[in-house]
Structure formats: C-alpha cells, structure tokens
C-alpha cells in the first residue's frame, strides 16, 4: 500500500496557546525508525517548525527546546504544539518519513490549520 | 579522473556559501549521451544513507560536516561507472528534491 | 517519460508527460539542463514553482500520471527536461525529454 499520511483540517488552540492534534500514517513497509516534521506553512514560505526521530515502540523526543511534544502509538503519532500566539496561526503540516530500515518513504499530510486566538488581558481589580 | 577496472577512487564534493551541516546531500552521475541516474544520499547529520542498486556493496557516501566536505568512495569500478558525477544539495525541507548542484567531475573507467 | 524528443517553435506550447509505475502521490520533481551544464531544479512537489521559475512552466498530476507544460516557448527553453519521484529510494529519473527547436 501507498504511503499516506492524514491529519485533521481545523485545530483551534487553547486559551494558553496550547494546540494538539494527530498525524496518522499509513505505512507501506515494516519500519522501525521514522522520523516526524511539523512544517508551517504562510503565506507560501515553509518554515520547519519541529522534528523528531523515533523507534517504533518508543517515545517521541523532541529537542529540549522544541515548542512541540508528542507520543506514539503504531503509526499513530499525537504532537502538541505550545507557546501558540495570534500571528502562529497558519498551516501545519505533518511530514512523515520512513527512515530505516531501506526503502526511504516519504509521506506529507495536507495540513491543519491552527487558529490562534490570543487572550483579552484581565481588567485591572480595584 | 581516469581509473582502471576494478580499481578505487574518491570523489570529494567542498559546498559553499549555505549552512552545509543542515542539509542533506545526494550524488548523480550521467553517462555519455545518457540520462540522469540517482546514486546515493546522505542526511544531514549523516545519520542515515540510501542507494541506487546498481552501486550498492561497492560505492559509500560520507561526509565531513566540520569540513563541508560531501565524500563518494568508489570501489571495483566498472566500464559502467564511467560518467560526470555531480553532487546536489537535498532541499531543507523536502531532502529528495536537489535544489543547487555542482558542476560535475567526469570519471573515465577504462583499462 | 514521453517523448523522448520533440521539435517545436518560439512560442509554441509544449506539453511533457511522466508516468510512474506506482502511485507517487504528488512527489515528483522537474529538472531543466542544458548541454555541458548542471541540472536546474524547476518544480517540486508535481506543481510548485521554485524561486526565479517564470510562470509559463506547470505542472500538474497525482498518482502515477503528471505532466509539465510550457506555455509559450522561449529560446532559452530549448533544453532537455527531466522528472524525478521523491517518493522512495531509489528516487528514479525519468529517461529525459530532449525540447529542440523546429
């Protein structure tokens, strides 16, 4: 089978900048190394939010930098994007390659846009 | 370069002018009068590495990132081999997509 | 990869079809190179342009079968033109499409 990668349409983000979503592949091969990407796309520039490489049956690590976390499960991979503000807002893009072992799969989902709403400040208490 | 059958030699690809260590890079060669033939790949990190069968067992990609140095390692070279090898940068976000490419170096295999 | 090679006039419009034994999805790439010259990188991703491409050159398919069109030939046109899969190793070219002028 053809390697596919899905992910939902529309997230909108939490109140704390917080946004999650799921990125599922379908694999055409037994990999056990894949590597995971969050690109943004905006106005037609793609910037390279995130990656990550795994082992199947591990967990996802990102860099201790990262603004992205995420867990795994089969070919099921949970990311979560934080520090989210306003101007984030944009197309994300989940990029999935099969790493190893040989062939090399490429697999790219069609996006979710994240909203991004920033909070109204609190009115001043007397 | 002119080798003979059977024997080595190494290919060394100096990049310039980008952030090398953050991309990956692929070889390519053509034939005389022939096509495109992908050959090999190499991660930016030099993590991972995939390549064409027809080279597989007797060519290794490598690279030195503290030298920006892209390295082809041919080995029992063959009549067939004979091509210019071009080394291409893979595309910051798409690897497999060659974006800038060298000028070629031709290697001659003949006895 | 077809045709191999065609002959056409300033002006023209060209179109160049390559079909992949397998479904790709949309990970195909088109290279330009002209003789004793190093090849250029025009489309990626079946249709997007890369930075300095004139807009006369699309591309377009999904799955197995994609084309490039150049809408009006220009005289710097003249060249061979390649496609390429990014899908999976090994990431195969096409046998090329030599654009000559008639």
């Known amino acids: 089978k053809a390697m596919h990668v899905a992910q939902p349409a529309v997230v909108l983000a939490s109140s704390r900048g917080i946004a999650s979503f799921v990125c599922e592949y379908a694999s055409p091969g037994k990999a056990t190394e894949v590597r995971v990407t969050v690109l943004r796309q905006a106005d037609s520039q793609v910037t390279e939010v995130c990656a990550a490489t795994y082992m199947m049956g591990n967990e996802l690590t990102f860099l201790d930098d990262s603004i992205c976390t995420g867990t795994s499960s089969g070919n099921q991979v949970n990311l979560t994007i934080q520090g989210l503000r306003a101007m984030d807002t944009g197309l994300y893009i989940c990029k999935v390659e099969l790493m190893y072992p040989p062939p090399y799969y490429l697999g790219i989902g069609n996006g979710t846009q994240i909203y991004v709403i920033d909070p109204e400040p609190c009115p001043d208490s007397d | 370069g002119v080798v003979q059958p059977g024997r080595s030699l190494r290919l060394s690809c100096a990049a310039s002018?980008?952030?090398?260590?953050?991309?990956?890079m692929h070889w390519v060669r053509q034939a005389p009068g022939k096509g495109l033939e992908w050959v090999a790949v190499i991660w930016y990190d030099g993590s991972n590495k995939y390549y064409a069968d027809s080279v597989k067992g007797r060519f290794t990609i490598s690279r030195d990132n503290s030298k920006n140095t892209l390295y082809l390692q041919m080995n029992s070279l063959r009549a067939e081999d004979t091509a210019v090898y071009y080394c291409a940068r893979g595309a910051r976000i798409i690897t497999p997509c060659m974006d800038v490419w060298g000028q070629g170096t031709t290697v001659t295999v003949s006895s | 990869q077809s045709p191999s090679s065609l002959s056409a006039s300033v002006g023209d419009r060209v179109t160049i079809t390559c079909r992949a034994s397998q479904s790709i999805n949309t990970y195909l790439i088109w290279y330009q190179q002209k003789p004793g010259k190093a090849p250029n990188f025009l489309i990626s991703a079946t249709s997007i342009l890369q930075s300095g491409v004139p807009s006369r050159f699309r591309g377009s398919g999904s799955g197995t079968n994609f084309t490039l069109t150049i809408n009006s030939l220009h005289p710097e046109d003249f060249a061979t033109y390649y496609c390429?899969?990014?899908?999976?190793?090994?990431?195969?070219f096409g046998p090329g499409t030599k654009v000559d002028i008639k």
């Open positions: 390429q899969q990014s899908y999976s190793t090994p990431f195969t």
């Open positions: 002018g980008f952030t090398f260590s953050s991309y990956g």
